[in-house]
């Protein structure tokens, strides 16, 4: 018969023959022959292969380096890599999460639109008219200006995006 030019799913072509790939969690030791099946071996401790493969070496589990602010979010298995995340107050610098940086704080005049997570930084927004923030914070939203009217007071000093309004007593009409 004609040697194959393509193989079925979970097979690979070698020496004009279709051999079975090794299942996830196992590596290739020897190719199949006309008389023998593909020989595979389980990955060792702290190693993994996450797909049907013909790799002769397993991948090392990712190391979540605490010196880079990393910690283990999910321990790796023979079929999955370790997933790292960042310590509290820090977030990953890339999709692969290889290092962490401190969450940014929103400066006075800006409030937190979205609090940071282990994988995304703080998102700040400028305080709109009627709101202010007088602190640098990774958690504080813009606060509304104090309503002097509800306290039977009047505005003595207008608010800005960084300061609250200053309320004072209403001027008494002189006799």
């Amino acid at each position: 018969p004609e040697p194959p030019t393509a193989c079925r799913e979970k097979q690979y072509l070698i020496n004009s023959q279709c051999c079975s790939l090794c299942q996830p969690g196992q590596k290739l030791v020897s190719d199949c022959t006309e008389f023998t099946e593909t020989e595979c071996l389980p990955c060792g401790e702290s190693e993994f292969l996450d797909t049907w493969n013909r790799e002769t070496h397993c991948h090392q589990h990712k190391y979540c380096d605490p010196n880079l602010g990393l910690r283990v979010q999910q321990k790796g298995t023979s079929e999955t890599d370790t997933i790292c995340t960042c310590e509290e107050g820090w977030h990953c610098t890339s999709e692969a999460c290889e290092s962490c940086v401190l969450h940014r704080s929103c400066s006075p005049g800006f409030g937190v639109k979205q609090i940071a997570t282990g994988v995304s930084d703080t998102i700040c927004e400028p305080c709109p008219v009627g709101f202010f923030s007088n602190v640098s914070s990774a958690f504080e939203k813009c606060h509304p200006w104090t309503s002097c009217e509800t306290k039977d007071l009047v505005v003595q000093q207008a608010g800005t995006n960084k300061t609250d309004v200053v309320c004072g007593p209403q001027d008494r009409l002189r006799a």
Epitope: A6, C7, Y12, L21, T51, H57, Q60
Partner: antibody, heavy 117, light 112 residues
């Protein structure tokens, strides 16, 4: 220091067999898959084939039968059985990241093969 | 065979700007992330920038960022510098296909 160096590239006439050699230093061929990639003048990169740590060779469909990859303990060879003018290119020997056959982190400088009558 | 299609073929960018290069695989790469990005300058061999779609290779500046999964991938270069002028290639891998590895056609980045 881990390095690769290709040799054997020269001007040959069509049909004249040619063997390119990749000499490795600083690492063991029992730990790394080795791949050949070529690049025709002014063109893109083309994956040719690889030989893995247990000595199994895999080829691009267009390269099967036209090229043979083999290795010793310190070198990898690419034999061009019957070159044509379309095989004129710089041939790179490359090393993969362990376990990642498509991620080539060490490249040789390349050797130029010119096939012309 | 897995086929990699890169767009655009050429891109002109100013210093300090951000450039995005796309790479599409004809079928899902292994583990949905077996994709690498390379940078090549004239007269030099290519240099590995990113592997497994988003992992930065040793010594590569964090201005280079890889993202994507399955069949759609992106290389983003932010704060472009003159030294980034080069041709960039993606390469995908799928063990079940005869042509297990394949390169994209390349994207030339010109820095103004």
């Amino acid at each position: 220091c881990q390095s690769l160096e290709e040799s054997g590239g020269r001007l040959v006439t069509p049909g004249t067999p040619l063997t390119l050699t990749c000499t490795v230093s600083g690492f063991s061929l029992s730990t790394y898959d080795m791949t050949w990639v070529r690049q025709a003048p002014g063109k893109g990169l083309e994956w040719l084939g690889l030989i893995n740590t247990i000595g199994s060779a895999y080829y691009a469909s267009w390269a099967s039968g036209r090229f043979t990859i083999s290795k010793t303990s310190t070198s990898v060879t690419l034999k061009m059985t019957s070159p044509t003018t379309e095989d004129t290119a710089t041939y790179f020997c490359v090393r993969g990241v362990p376990g990642y056959s498509s991620s080539f982190n060490i490249w040789g400088p390349g050797t130029l093969v010119t096939v012309s009558s | 065979a897995i086929v990699m299609t890169q767009t655009p073929s050429s891109k002109s960018v100013a210093v300090g700007d951000t450039v995005t290069i796309n790479c599409q695989a004809s079928e899902s790469v292994d583990s949905n992330k077996r994709l690498a990005w390379y940078q090549q300058k004239p007269g030099q061999p290519p240099k590995l920038l990113i592997y497994t779609a988003s992992t930065l290779a040793s010594g590569v500046p964090s201005r280079f960022k890889g993202s994507g999964s399955g069949t759609e991938f992106t290389l983003t270069i932010s704060d472009v510098v003159c030294d980034d002028a080069a041709t960039y290639y993606c390469a995908g891998y799928k063990a079940t296909t005869t042509d297990a590895s394949a390169f994209g056609g390349g994207t030339e980045v010109v820095v103004k």
